[in-house]
Structures are given as structure tokens and as C-alpha cells.
Amino acid sequence: EFEQAPEFLLGDGSFGSVYRAAYEGEEVAVKIFNKHTSLRLLRQELVVLCHLHHPSLISLLAAGIRPRMLVMELASKGSLDRLLQQDKASLTRTLQHRIALHVADGLRYLHSAMIIYRDLKPHNVLLFTLYPNAAIIAKIADYGIAQYCCRMGIKTSEGTPGFRAPEVARGNVIYNQQADVYSFGLLLYDILTTGGRIVEGLKFPNEFDELEIQGKLPDPVKEYGCAPWPMVEKLIKQCLKENPQERPTSAQVFDILNSAELVCLTRRILLPKNVIVECMVATHHNSRNASIWLGCGHTDRGQLSFLDLNTEGYTSEEVADSRILCLALVHLPVEKESWIVSGTQSGTLLVINTEDGKKRHTLEKMTDSVTCLYCNSFSKQSKQKNFLLVGTADGKLAIFEDKTVKLKGAAPLKILNIGNVSTPLMCLSESTNSTERNVMWGGCGTKIFSFSNDFTIQKLIETRTSQLFSYAAFSDSNIITVVVDTALYIAKQNSPVVEVWDKKTEKLCGLIDCVHFLREVTVKENKESKHKMSYSGRVKTLCLQKNTALWIGTGGGHILLLDLSTRRLIRVIYNFCNSVRVMMTAQLGSLKNVMLVLGYNRKNTEGTQKQKEIQSCLTVWDINLPHEVQNLEKHIEVRKELAEKMRRTSVE
């Protein structure tokens, strides 16, 4: 059933028109070619459509000669350019990603069949749903000028101004599939900027082609105000390389997009060189600003830096006589003020008001380096007191009432001697388990201890054990971090193992061997020896994502995500940097729940002395990364099955 009436018209083109119609009880799109359209054009499109069957390509259902027509599946949500112009609000980050992924999937399939598409643009991307986990979201349409390509490439100038590669626009130059990759880069740019460039292109059509051909496209984030998306921005740059050989292939583009990290890495900020960040703390989630305080410096000086995540503005000042090792944010709701407490290597506790940096003073000096700080929140109500807890390198735990941080030279309420010079108190942690709301845990030397709001030690667990087998040498090492859920997860100096201890039985109940997981990932490449891997797998930091995942950062720059309930590996983010230093969850203004990961990159500097320059790098991750890994894996699996089914059907 088919009527060439204006109300059924879906679109017009140089070839003819597309109408909504019914075919075998299904809604379809019928492409009617102009009377003067050559049969060659129809045949060409037929050849392509008949031989290619893929979830990312519009399927041909039937064809007719009089009138010349193609019957194809109908995309209920229209074209991508319509969405970009009329319904930007629907374009969530996940949906943006899935559209790009599906188009890249179709493109690599066409390229594997030696076909250059030559007219990739938002108008030719059709949408079937806006549900981001649907198996079919976007498909490539309009094969009018797709062409089989011999190894040498083709010469004719085709495509649409503003959406084509420089070598295509120039004409009379041989080009190949890499021209489509350039167009894909533009498509990705348009998805990221929700079509800002296209709107301007309609106003200034002459400049539209010029800008993109000359590689003068404005920075998507600065110019169009879209949220940063580091790995997508990088991919756009790669696709838009002037030299086609320098662009990734469509298969490589698909592989890059097929990554949860790409979706969830929302910021990557390089800090000034040789600012070696030791610790960080995020501003209170009630704050309007998404900002972070960073503690750094060298042995003889301490720097406190402030980073505004919205503007990426960075300020730094020397505040102490020695390196800052730890930071805490003390929020006083009654006074409606917040203070940053810096613990230094020399034992100084420096307190600075977050609103007025001139308001600053020191508390009573500690007897050794301040190795950890924690502002507990035993009570969210103001009736019960909250405390600032200070751990030192000589094993002491100093307890300050939170309100006293405002007072110069304030002394602690109480000092507990838990360890000694050989056993530093390295970490303090609150349980994420709701049944243990008022319990704090810490690590001192090789012991784990717990206490509640009366500050009497409840449990003292000695973690020296002969059960570490090949890692027995690390059993005597000092604990550097403890995180607590239903179990205790501890990491020790230089050890590549996370020990899991049962709180009730006080026994070792599991080992998470990072070397094992890293070897699984790198076994194909056979990259590193066991010793090297043990060193690069040494655990530097742990972070618990409640009821979801354990994040492990290693000294070799890898991030491991483990499912909390099964302790199975979800993902290894391999060689993320040279060394991971700090990981913490935060609620940052409009960024909502995020994981902040701070790492170091070492670069060899020029010159004869192979001195390594260290650069700190802060990354912000969407907290949903563990879920996204699993969602994307499922998504890809479903699409693989679909592609296989379509391939089998076409053979039959």
C-alpha cells in the first residue's frame, strides 16, 4: 500500500523522494527515483543492498522497476540530523556513544566488503529507538553513491560539502575508505556538539566545507560549550588527520569506541610538570563548585593547590615547610563553613578556611609525620560530636573535636598510642556497611584495628600470616590502606596482593592477586616477566564503590575493577598512567557521583642526564563504569548474534 501524498513524504533528495508506506503489513520506507534517474544508479544501490546484511545497514525488502523504487525498512525515529536539530535533550552521553558505535560498526562492515560509502553525514544516519541499550539504534542509509573500491582507490568527487574528506572535496585525487573515516570524525564531532556546526553551516554554506577541509573546526568543548569527553575528542582528532594514512581504519575506530572507559572517562586534566601530588580532597557535595584541593610539594616545602573542575583553573601556593602527605575537609554545618586540614611530613597540621584563604593557622604539632587524616561523620545530626582523626608515622592516633579546627594551636582531645616508629598508622576508614555505622577501622604497622565513637580500641587484628604462599615476603610489610565493607580489604607496602580479612573470625579469608589478573590481560602480548609484573602490580590505593566494585590502583599505572560480591574481575584498565596514586569517590556539583583517580606520568627529559620529569594527571570517571563495562559487553554480544543471524539468513 503506497500513496505519493505529501503527508507520507519522509524526505527529498537529488535522486527522488522517500515516502512512508505499508508492505506485507509492516510500515516501510519507499524510495521513489526520479524518472530521469539512470538505471545504473538504481542497480548500484540494489547491488550494495542485496549483498550486504548487517544490523547497522538499512535492509532492502523489495525493489521495483516501474516506477523505479526500493522498499526499505522504516526508521521510526527519523534521521540523526533531525534529532540534532529538534530533540537535543534526548541525546544522553550513552546514546551519543551507541549511535557512534553502531555507525562505526556499519562502516567497518562496508569497508570489509571493499565499499566506500562516500556520503556519511547525520542526514544518512537513521534512528530506530532512543533507548541506549537497544540492540538496534542507528543504521546507515542511502547507498546512492557507495562504490566498490579496488586497492588503488577511486577518483570521482562525491559526498556532501561540509561532510567530506579534503581529498574527496579536492577532486581528481585517488582516495579510499579512509575518506569515510574523515567523514566519521565529522559525524562524531556533530554528535558531540549536538549539531552546532550544522546550524552555522546552514547560515554560511560557503564556509561550511572550507573550515572542515582545512582542519579549522573549533574546539568542541570551548566553542560549543559541551561537556568534555576526552577519549572522544582524541578520536575525532585522529579521524580528522589531513593525511588519510594517519587516520585509524574503521575497524580501529570501532575497537576504540567499543570501550566502557571511553564512555565513562569524563575529564583528564594534566597538572603542571613536577607538581607531585600526594593527596587530594573534594569540596563538599553541597558546594556549587566542582573543585578539588591537592596536597603536594617536596621534602622541604609543602604546596596546596586548588583545581576548579568546571574551568580547569589551577592555583597553587606554598603553605608549609614540608611536603603535604594528607588532606581532610572539615565541614561545620552550624557555622556554615569548611576548613581544609593539611598534614605534613614534619608533623604540622595546617588549617585553611575554604572560603577565605587568609584565615589560616596550625593546630598542635604532631610528634612525627602526619600519615593520614579522616573527618568522620558518626552522626549527621548536630547533637552528636564529629571528630578529626589524625594518624602519625610513629603509630599515634590523635583525636580532635571537629569544631576545634577553627582554633589556633588547638590540642587533641585524646592521643592513642597504637604503634611506634616502626609501625606507622597509615590509614583510617569508615565502613560502607550500613550495619556498622559507628565503627571506624585503621591500619597500623601490620595490625588492623577498629574503634567506635568512644575511641576505645575494639578489635586489633594481626595480619602477619603464613597463608600468603608465594607472596609470604609481603606479610610483614606495613599496611598502607584499608577499605571496609562486609569484609576488610587491605594493601601492604610493595605488595601486589589485596588481603581480604573476615571481621568476625579475624582470619584471612581471601587474596586478590593483581599479578594474576594482569597476566590474564597481557598473556597474549607476553609483555612482562613475573618480577616486573609483581612490581607494576603493587597496590598503591584502594577504593570501595558501595555494593558494586572494588577499585584497585597499582604502582605500574593499572586500574583493576572487581565485582564486590563475587570478587571476579570486571575490567583491567591497563597502563592507564605510570603510577596510580590516589582514588576516591566524590559528589561534585553537576558531575554527580564520580570516581577521582590521580596518577603520575614520567617523561624522560631532553639532555644527557636521563632525569625523569613527573607530571600528575587527574581523571574523573563516571561512577557507573563497572555497570557500563557489563552493559556494553552484553550490547556487543547481542549485536554479534544479530549480525550472525542476518548473515546466515542472507546465505539461505
Epitope: 607531585i276 600526594e278 614534619s346 610528634t367 610513629d394
Partner: nanobody
Framework: QVQLVESGGGLVQPGGSLRLSCVAS????????MGWYRQAPGKQRELVAL???????NYGDSVKGRFTISRDNAKNTGYLQMNSLKPEDTAVYYC???????????WGQGTQVTVSS
């Protein structure tokens, strides 16, 4: 990466003295604590002495009153002055350094000390 080189070991008669040095080099941005440990054949490695950044010290029971640990922060060097040496002090002496917020640990290759007449 921090490299540690120990020196000053050797053969000494009972009652004699030796001074061990440990020099740290490489990517150093903060050395927190320096320590000396020793391992005699067939025995476990044990703490000899430890010094904090502020100069706080800790000694193994068997060397208290005879050994003194010190450090020169400007030179990234640690020292162990060993007096009234006994045959049971014979061991390989290792230097250990903690860097970067106490989470990184680096060990030297060791220097042999033999006390014998």
C-alpha cells in the same frame, strides 16, 4: 624509582667499629624514613635501626646502646655507626627507604659485615 647503594661493610675484629652509609639516588621527591635491617645465614631479616624524617629513632633490642643511626637529608644519605661489634652481628646489612607518603619501599643490595678474630 629510587636506587640505594650501601657501603662501609667489611671484616672487623670483635669490639671494633664500622660505619655504614646508604646513598639514595634516582627519582627522589621525598624520603620519609630510612632503616637498616640485617640477615644472618639461615635466619630471618630483622630490624637493626630506623630513623624518621624528624629524627625519631627505633633500635632492635640486640643493638641498643651500641649502634647509632643518623641521616643527612640534604645528601639523601643514611648512616649506621656500629660500635662494640660482636660475632653475632655478622650478617648482610640492608638499607631500606620509604618514599612518597610511606607507600613506596626501596631496598639496597646489601653490604656484608663480618665480625671475627
Amino acid at each position: 624509582q629510587v636506587q640505594l647503594v650501601e657501603s662501609g661493610g667489611g671484616l672487623v675484629q670483635p669490639g671494633g667499629s664500622l660505619r655504614l652509609s646508604c646513598v639514595a639516588s634516582g627519582t627522589i621527591y621525598a624520603i620519609n624514613r630510612m632503616g637498616w635491617y640485617r640477615q644472618a645465614p639461615g635466619k630471618q631479616r630483622e630490624l637493626v635501626a630506623l630513623i624518621t624524617l624528624g629524627g625519631g629513632t627505633n633500635y632492635g633490642d640486640s643493638v641498643k646502646g651500641r649502634f647509632t643511626i643518623s641521616r643527612d637529608n640534604a645528601k639523601n644519605t643514611g648512616y649506621l655507626q656500629m660500635n662494640s661489634l660482636k660475632p653475632e652481628d655478622t650478617a648482610v646489612y640492608y638499607c631500606k627507604v620509604e618514599s612518597s607518603g610511606y607507600t613506596d619501599v626501596f631496598w639496597g643490595q646489601g653490604t656484608q659485615v663480618t665480625v671475627s678474630s
